[in-house]
Interface confidence: low
């Protein structure tokens, strides 16, 4: 048993048929010694008397809010949550496996630049009685500070018969140098509580590996005289790290016909312009990637050819 | 990603081309190591991230773009320990900080060169003959060092009579390649920045 926060405790249970469970001793937070009684949740049934209460926690029925009283007055509460371990593996019932980039990916994180700011998100099909708490640090044995905001519901979508809820959180490394070479990964820890079930999820990454620039901005076409060619130009996204001569991007320019089956023409360039042939009803798209460290490409910025 | 390789103009900052080749070579070598040593911990998640140049050079600090010198987090350990004259910059542009920066890069390359050569000597003794260092990568390190043209005493290659632990050496190779790739990225950024300025 361990304390998650004030008056909230997590009981770790091996979860199998006829498991013996865990013996837990609760102590009433009061100077009083006599006339103390204990109840569970909203029940008025007295479970025991005295300053301490010993219980055998085996299942969710044994979890909940234990309250000690004296003469009708509440003295203190202890909320017991369960953390299930089945076949040596902690349960992951609350969040959905996003399966990207690999199986058992429950948290996904991205950064738009090297400033030390990043966003993590996760998915669940649970809509109520759900709380999340996020902590983060740089390194684990001698952690350096990362400040995370509150997790918020950022999107809802329907998948078949199910509704899926996306939660996200923004974090900022307290003292980040964009040019630094990371040797310790960022650790993100999410505590998830659904009713009386506790689970924790972790992700470990280097900012350099989760970089995904915003799409190039101000994408413009300039037709070239007496030619089917056009000059495409764009700019670095505002959110990208500066100076751009140090944090350079490389770009992919794509000409795509209306039909997805049509052949795509692609050009790679380090410049912020390119000359391409503009076909009728086609569109021109440009995306960006760190020039020197191949993390994710940005989403496409697009303009129609016409 | 296969991008066409641009040939630098004769007037272009001469080290930029070499640093681009360096990053390409170390990335290829790392990819080869990951594939060849698939049963070893060789991915970024599995290895311990070590920097053999730690406390020896200060490349990130010495080569910090001017725009980032206002960022206090970047100035924790700004050192000024390298005063030399490199040939990568036209002399009129060579400032104290630039010389310091290029000298630090040179020292990095020298340290990695020694480590890689020592490691290759061990790998050549492996009866499994599983992996060797790409000679192109070693050559590219050499070329960039020559382009930087700093006078420095040569460090003798570490020789050892003991039977090497080939497992350890291969894990160490992965660690070294990951670290060197990160440093090569920094070097490329620096050269690009100096070229633009």
């Amino acid at each position: 048993i361990w304390e998650l926060k004030k008056d909230v405790y997590v009981v770790e249970l091996d979860w199998y048929p006829d498991a013996p469970g865990e013996m837990v001793v609760l102590t009433c937070d009061t100077p009083e010694e006599d006339g103390i009684t204990w109840t569970l949740d909203q029940s008025s049934e007295v479970l025991g008397s005295g300053k301490t209460l010993t219980i055998q926690v085996k299942e969710f029925g044994d979890a909940g809010q234990y309250t000690c009283h004296k003469g009708g007055e509440v003295l203190s509460h202890s909320l017991l949550l369960l953390h299930k371990k089945e076949d040596g593996i902690w349960s992951t019932d609350i969040l959905k496996d996003q399966k990207e980039p690999k199986n058992k990916t429950f948290l996904r994180c991205e950064a738009k630049n090297y400033s030390g700011r990043f966003t993590c998100w996760w998915l669940t099909t649970i809509s109520t009685d759900l709380t999340f708490s996020v902590k983060s640090s740089r390194g684990s044995s001698d952690p350096q500070g990362v400040t995370c905001g509150a997790a918020t519901l950022s999107a809802e979508r329907v998948r078949g018969d199910n509704k899926e809820y996306e939660y996200s959180v923004e974090c900022q490394e307290d003292s980040a140098c964009p040019a630094a070479e990371e040797s310790l990964p960022i650790e993100v820890m999410v505590d998830a509580v659904h009713k009386l079930k506790y689970e924790n999820y972790t992700s470990s990454f280097f900012i350099r590996d989760i970089i995904k620039p915003d799409p190039p901005k101000n994408l413009q076409l300039k037709p070239l005289k007496n030619s089917r060619q056009v000059e495409v130009s764009w700019e670095y996204p505002d959110t990208w790290s500066t100076p751009h001569s140090y944090f350079s991007l490389t770009f992919c320019v794509q000409v795509q016909g209306k039909s997805k089956r049509e052949k795509k023409d692609r050009v790679f360039t380090d410049k912020t312009s390119a000359t391409v042939i503009c076909r009728k009803n086609a569109s021109i798209s440009v995306r960006a990637q760190d020039r020197y460290y191949s993390s994710s490409w940005s989403e496409w910025a697009s303009v129609p050819c016409s | 990603r296969n991008l066409p390789v641009a040939t630098p103009d004769p007037g272009m900052f001469p080290c930029l081309h070499h640093s681009q080749n360096l990053l390409r070579a170390v990335s290829n070598m790392l990819q080869k190591a990951r594939q060849t040593l698939e049963f070893y911990p060789c991915t970024s998640e599995e290895i311990d991230h070590e920097d053999i140049t730690k406390d020896k050079t200060s490349t990130v600090e010495a080569c910090l773009p001017l725009e980032l010198t206002k960022n206090e987090s970047c100035l924790n350990s700004r050192e000024t320990s390298f005063i030399t004259n490199g040939s990568c910059l036209a002399s009129r542009k060579t400032s104290f900080m630039m010389a310091l920066c290029l000298s630090s890069i040179y020292e990095d390359l020298k340290m990695y060169q020694v480590e890689f050569k020592t490691m290759n000597a061990k790998l050549l003794m492996d009866p499994k003959r599983q992996i060797f260092l790409d000679q192109n990568m070693l050559a590219v390190i050499d070329e960039l060092m020559q382009a930087l043209n700093f006078n420095s005493e040569t460090v003798p290659q570490k020789s050892s009579l003991e039977e090497p632990d080939f497992y350890k050496t291969k894990i160490k190779l992965c660690i070294l390649l990951h670290a060197f790739r990160i440093r090569a990225v920094t070097i490329d950024r620096v050269m690009s920045y100096l070229n633009a300025s």
Epitope: - | F39, Y40, P41, E46, D48, E50, I52, E115, K158, S160, E162, E163, P164, D165, Y167, K168, I171, K172
Partner: antibody, heavy 119, light 107 residues
Framework: EVTLRESGPALVKPTQTLTLTCTFS??????????VSWIRQPPGKALEWLAH???????YYNPSLKSRLTISKDTSKNQVVLTMTNMDPVDTATYYC???????????WGQGTTVTVSS | DIVMTQSPDSLAVSLGERATINCKAS??????VAWYQQKPGQPPKLLIY???NRYTGVPDRFSGSGYGTDFTLTISSLQAEDVAVYYC?????????FGGGTKVEIK
Amino acid sequence: EVTLRESGPALVKPTQTLTLTCTFSGFSLRKSVMGVSWIRQPPGKALEWLAHIYWDDDKYYNPSLKSRLTISKDTSKNQVVLTMTNMDPVDTATYYCTRRGIRSAMDYWGQGTTVTVSS
Amino acid sequence: DIVMTQSPDSLAVSLGERATINCKASQSVSNDVAWYQQKPGQPPKLLIYYASNRYTGVPDRFSGSGYGTDFTLTISSLQAEDVAVYYCQQDYNSPWTFGGGTKVEIK
């Protein structure tokens, strides 16, 4: 939870062969880069590495004792066996088996077994 | 064989004070050095690997540094439970070798 336990005779006579067994749990020698080492420590003295066996049966020995040592493993039983021939009173020591993992250091140790060589 | 020479042989430090143990390798061992703590009647415990990486669960008052031939283990603020013998070990090359040990006591 990783545990290692050494077993073998507490007393052996000079010139006899010592056989020590390390029984471990919580990890497998089927996993790459896992290995088990034997280390000894004479009373009041420093540690001395004896031998190591890797997951794929590659073996390393301390050259000063190589001719007397044999290390082997039984992966299915989670056991590693060390034999040391021609025992001498100077071989009196606590013998430890240890796991050497990815970190390339002895991260888990058995409690050790004390072996006395005396006639 | 690579010889690991530890100094001093023993060290008496007041509680809360800094304790520093040195280890010198007879040839370069890169950063392939581990540090162990051994209390009487117990097996050694891993503290530091790859010269400067604290092992899981090791208090942050323990730190390691060094590269090549010279290595240091520092206990920034000695606690009563730190009384033990400390060993350095190289696994750069076979045979893996240990230092002679440094006994740390309270002054």
